[in-house]
Interface confidence: low
């Protein structure tokens, strides 16, 4: 099974020794988060401070299974959530078309060897879109006109100011702008290590390993069952080092 035999070193993990020790790992999560009804949200967990080998990550809502990222069998999305849940990024889970009923606790459950099970908790609150936001669609033409006017005025001011400044000052502004862009980018949640072979590798095609020589309907059903579709954003879980 070539597609699923990579270590999750993006999670800071390596092949664990067989001797079982203390459970030293910790789960970092996105914590308490909120999102608007109809929108989407990314649930993220990150296991750190352990050398344990991750064999599977379950995503659950209360006692209901949402999805599984499994080392050997790839992603599995629970049929009842198939239309609204997308795997990734990484070991995370994307919830789409949120409803108020999606409010509640979500758990990431890491099955590891030899440590056992680690669980992280995320509380999601789905907010009703406000009346002001509903009314915004009628205000768009007016706001657009106002914004255009402001842009013209600001542009004129900037041109005038720019012409009166020295080139040195211009360079400083440029550097400051670049720094602001970089710091804004760093606010996004990201794993502590590079993602390239990161546990769920991006893949365009369905994994051959699950079906091997098998062809036909069963193979297609299998791919469908594990929700392995042919587009880039959906990854395969890849946990173990390939040995041939």
């Amino acid at each position: 099974m070539r597609w699923c035999l990579l270590l999750i070193w993006a999670q800071g993990l390596r092949q664990a020794p067989l001797a079982s020790g203390m459970m030293t790992g910790t789960i970092e999560t996105t914590g308490n988060i909120s999102a608007e009804k109809g929108g989407s949200i990314i649930l993220q967990c990150h296991l750190s401070s352990t050398t344990a080998q991750v064999t599977q990550v379950n995503w659950e809502q209360q006692d209901q299974l949402l999805a599984i990222c499994n080392a050997d069998l790839g992603w599995h999305i629970s049929p009842s959530f198939k239309d609204r849940v997308a795997p990734g990024p990484g070991l995370g889970l994307t919830l789409q078309s949120l409803t108020v009923n999606d409010t509640g606790e979500y758990f990431c459950i890491y099955h590891t060897y030899p440590d056992g099970t680690y669980t992280g908790r995320i509380f999601l609150e789905v907010l009703e879109s406000s009346v002001a936001e509903h009314g915004a669609r009628f205000q768009i033409p007016l706001l657009g006109a106002m914004a255009a006017t402001l842009v013209v005025i600001c542009t004129a001011v900037i041109v005038v100011v720019a012409l009166t400044r020295k080139k040195k000052a211009l360079r400083i502004h440029s550097v400051e702008g670049d720094l602001r862009r970089k710091s804004a980018g760093q606010e996004e949640w990201s794993p502590s290590a590079p993602s390239p072979p990161g546990s769920c590798v991006q893949a365009e095609a369905a994994p051959a390993g699950l079906c091997g020589e098998q062809r036909g309907e069963d193979c297609a059903e299998l791919h469908d069952y594990f929700n392995v579709l042919s587009y880039r954003s959906l990854g395969n879980c890849s946990f173990f080092t390939e040995t041939g």
Epitope: Q53, G209, E221
Partner: antibody, heavy 119, light 107 residues
Framework: QVQLKESGPGLVAPSQSLSITCTVS????????ISWIRQPPGKGLEWLGV???????NYNSAFMSRLSISKDNSKSQVFLKMNSLQTDDTAIYYC?????????????WGQGTSVTVSS | DILLTQSPAILSVSPGERVSFSCRAS??????IHWYQQRTNGSPRLLIK???ESISGIPSRFSGSGSGTDFTLSINSVESEDIADYYC?????????FGAGTKLELK
């Protein structure tokens, strides 16, 4: 309480078909997959195939041409049909609960139904 | 198909002894191995999943270890009720396969 119970014909003539029904209780077939496993007398276990919660199936390639698994969720029943039986198909046939949650570890087994292929 | 080789075929032990069952896979299967006990005329019973994870209701004397291709089921102090056949099963890829089993008997 989780239970699985197989019911079969007991005796089947060579070249005939085998039909076994597995009736489950204590859980829903929309939440758990069911695998079929058989065990010839004095021998080991052999996985035949699985039917998933959504009704999709995957069969052991050794049996694909003559095996069919289906189910009726409302009746909590799973059906195995195997065609063209030969004497070496004599075995105890088990229906087993298996799921992605336990990564196809078979956590509950039926008591098995004995099938003898003989004329 | 992934071949699982169990050894030895028969293990003879005395009550109270520690015993280990071996299961070797024909290729790397991570920790996708499960262990079952089957007493005479009974159905198999799941003992260990994922190579090492315990199952509710199974005595703590049963433990599992291993990763990759070599796996071990251990009973740290055999009791007479443990006399049975023991099977390993892989769920790394289709078809799911079982080892041929190891018979545990009393000396």
């Amino acid at each position: 309480q989780v239970q699985l119970k197989e019911s079969g014909p007991g005796l089947v003539a060579p070249s005939q078909s085998l039909s076994i029904t597995c009736t489950v209780s204590g859980f829903s077939l929309t939440s758990y997959d069911i695998s079929w496993i058989r065990q010839p007398p004095g021998k080991g276990l052999e996985w035949l195939g699985v039917i998933w919660t959504g009704g999709g199936t995957n069969y052991n390639s050794a049996f694909m041409s003559r095996l069919s698994i289906s189910k009726d969720n409302s009746k909590s029943q799973v059906f195995l049909k195997m065609n063209s039986l030969q004497t070496d198909d004599t075995a105890i046939y088990y229906c087993v609960r298996s799921t992605m949650i336990t990564h196809y570890a078979m956590d509950y087994w039926g008591q098995g139904t004995s099938v003898t292929v003989s004329s | 198909d992934i071949l699982l080789t169990q050894s030895p075929a028969i293990l003879s032990v005395s009550p109270g002894e520690r015993v280990s069952f071996s299961c070797r896979a024909s290729q790397n299967i991570g920790t996708s191995i499960h262990w079952y006990q089957q007493r005479t005329n009974g159905s198999p019973r799941l003992l260990i999943k994922y190579a090492f994870e315990s199952i509710s209701g199974i005595p703590s004397r049963f433990s599992g270890s291993g990763s990759g291709t070599d796996f071990t089921l251990s009973i740290n102090s055999v009791e007479s009720e443990d006399i049975a056949d023991y099977y390993c099963q892989q769920s790394n890829s289709w078809p799911l396969t079982f080892g041929a089993g190891t018979k545990l008997e009393l000396k």
